[in-house]
Amino acid sequence: LPAQVAFTPYAPEPGSTCRLREYYDQTAQMCCSKCSPGQHAKVFCTKTSDTVCDSCEDSTYTQLWNWVPECLSCGSRCSSDQVETQACTREQNRICTCRPGWYCALSKQEGCRLCAPLRKCRPGFGVARPGTETSDVVCKPCAPGTFSNTTSSTDICRPHQICNVVAIPGNASMDAVCTSTSPTRSMAPGAVHLPQPVSTRSQHTQPTPEPSTAPSTSFLLPMGPSPPAEGSTGD
């Protein structure tokens, strides 16, 4: 014969545990029903009556099947540097994440405790590593032949335009200026910069010094981290 289905509350067999969505009440010594997400235990079970559940009040929640006497309070409203990506409901807590242009400098279990503005790279520097939800932008000096003339958390170093006749040479923070009579062309987007030695423009007129113990780059891509500033001493 199939075992009879027990209805809560019931006394468990010695050595066995209560079923899914049930809990063992120490006082009643019975298996009793848990309350569903969005509810809490208003009255605990006895030997003869099951748990009485009630809905969570405004600004409180329970996310799991539970037998807590009170629902949990939702977190405080999101700050001005945050956006609410999950509203406070009876079944879930409010989740605040950093708004665009910011990153999470101090996270909590869900969402972010402290947001900080993404670093902006000044002219002569470009974004080498973009910011993410949890990490800041990293800026690097623009490589010879590239420049950035903006203060931006997204702009990378761009290639100087190539002139038939250069009126003003470009540097790390300024594009080359061509003479108006000569036709110009820009380096194709996504073009690979020719491999650069680790020596920089400030060393081009002298023998290359002993190599740095820092790792060197073999190939430089316009999108990638860029080596040294060209013209950054404003010669």
């Epitope: 800026c139 820092a214 040294p228 001493t233 404003g234």
Partner: antibody, heavy 119, light 106 residues
Framework: QVQLVQSGAEVKKPGASVKVSCKAS????????IHWVRQAPGQGLEWMGW????????DYADKFKKRVTMTADTSISTAFMELSRLRSDDTAVYYC????????????WGQGTLVTVSS | DIQMTQSPSSLSASVGDRVTITCNGA??????LAWFQQKPGKAPKLLIY???SLQTGVPSRFSGSRSGTDFTLTISSLQPEDFATYFC????????FGGGTKLELK
């Protein structure tokens, strides 16, 4: 907290070289360039150059191009500045300072290293 | 390089005074000008960056402004700990410090 700790004072003879170190802690060393700035006794501040520890790339002030070499060892988060063919007017306190490439420039400095050049 | 002309080179003032120090850049340097404070035997300390922005932890009596190519550091009410040497620093087109202003107690 962010710290830049420099090597101790040096006394050198004219014509010799000196190598000053700057050990960084409290931040990601490769995310910042390191500037070197010097100050002769009773004088102002003079920018010498920078190094990007991530790639070893450098940029030097014209005045120092032929005599200075800046390097970095990322394994020990340390930047180095070597000045060769020393003269008496190189007697100065040499400082390192970090810079993240944002408008917030040189927000942390080493304590300085006095280099005395004397025969 | 862009030369930075700082004035005055020295200045005597009393506690409570309002003090201004000026730096002039011959060319346009955008707003990439910083001010540093240095006390004897100590490393410089960043006070203001990008002409106007106060570095974290710096008292609000320090402020920066500009008019054309003239950049100004103002200390609204001098405190005893403010007597030091101040340097401007441009970092838009290369890097260049001003000559410094020594602020002394009158």
């Amino acid at each position: 907290q962010v710290q830049l700790v420099q090597s101790g004072a040096e006394v050198k003879k004219p014509g010799a070289s000196v190598k000053v170190s700057c050990k960084a802690s409290g931040y990601t060393f490769t995310d910042y360039i390191i500037h070197w700035v010097r100050q002769a006794p009773g004088q102002g501040l003079e920018w010498m150059g920078w190094i990007d520890p991530d790639y070893g790339n450098t940029d030097y002030a014209d005045k120092f191009k032929k005599r200075v070499t800046m390097t970095a060892d990322t394994s020990i988060s340390t930047a180095f500045m070597e000045l060769s063919r020393l003269r008496s007017d190189d007697t100065a306190v040499y400082y390192c300072a970090r810079d993240d490439g944002s408008p917030l420039v040189m927000d942390a400095w080493g304590q300085g290293t006095l280099v005395t050049v004397s025969s | 390089d862009i030369q930075m002309t700082q004035s005055p080179s020295s200045l005597s003032a009393s506690v409570g005074d309002r003090v201004t120090i000026t730096c002039n850049g011959a060319q346009n340097i955008d707003n990439y000008l910083a001010w540093f404070q240095q006390k004897p035997g100590k490393a410089p300390k960043l006070l203001i960056y990008s002409t106007y922005s106060l570095q974290t932890g710096v008292p609000s009596r320090f402020s920066g402004s500009r008019s054309g190519t003239d950049f100004t550091l103002t200390i609204s009410s001098l405190q005893p700990e403010d007597f030091a040497t101040y340097f401007c620093f441009q970092y838009n087109n290369g890097y260049m410090f001003g000559g410094g202003t020594k602020l002394e107690l009158k």
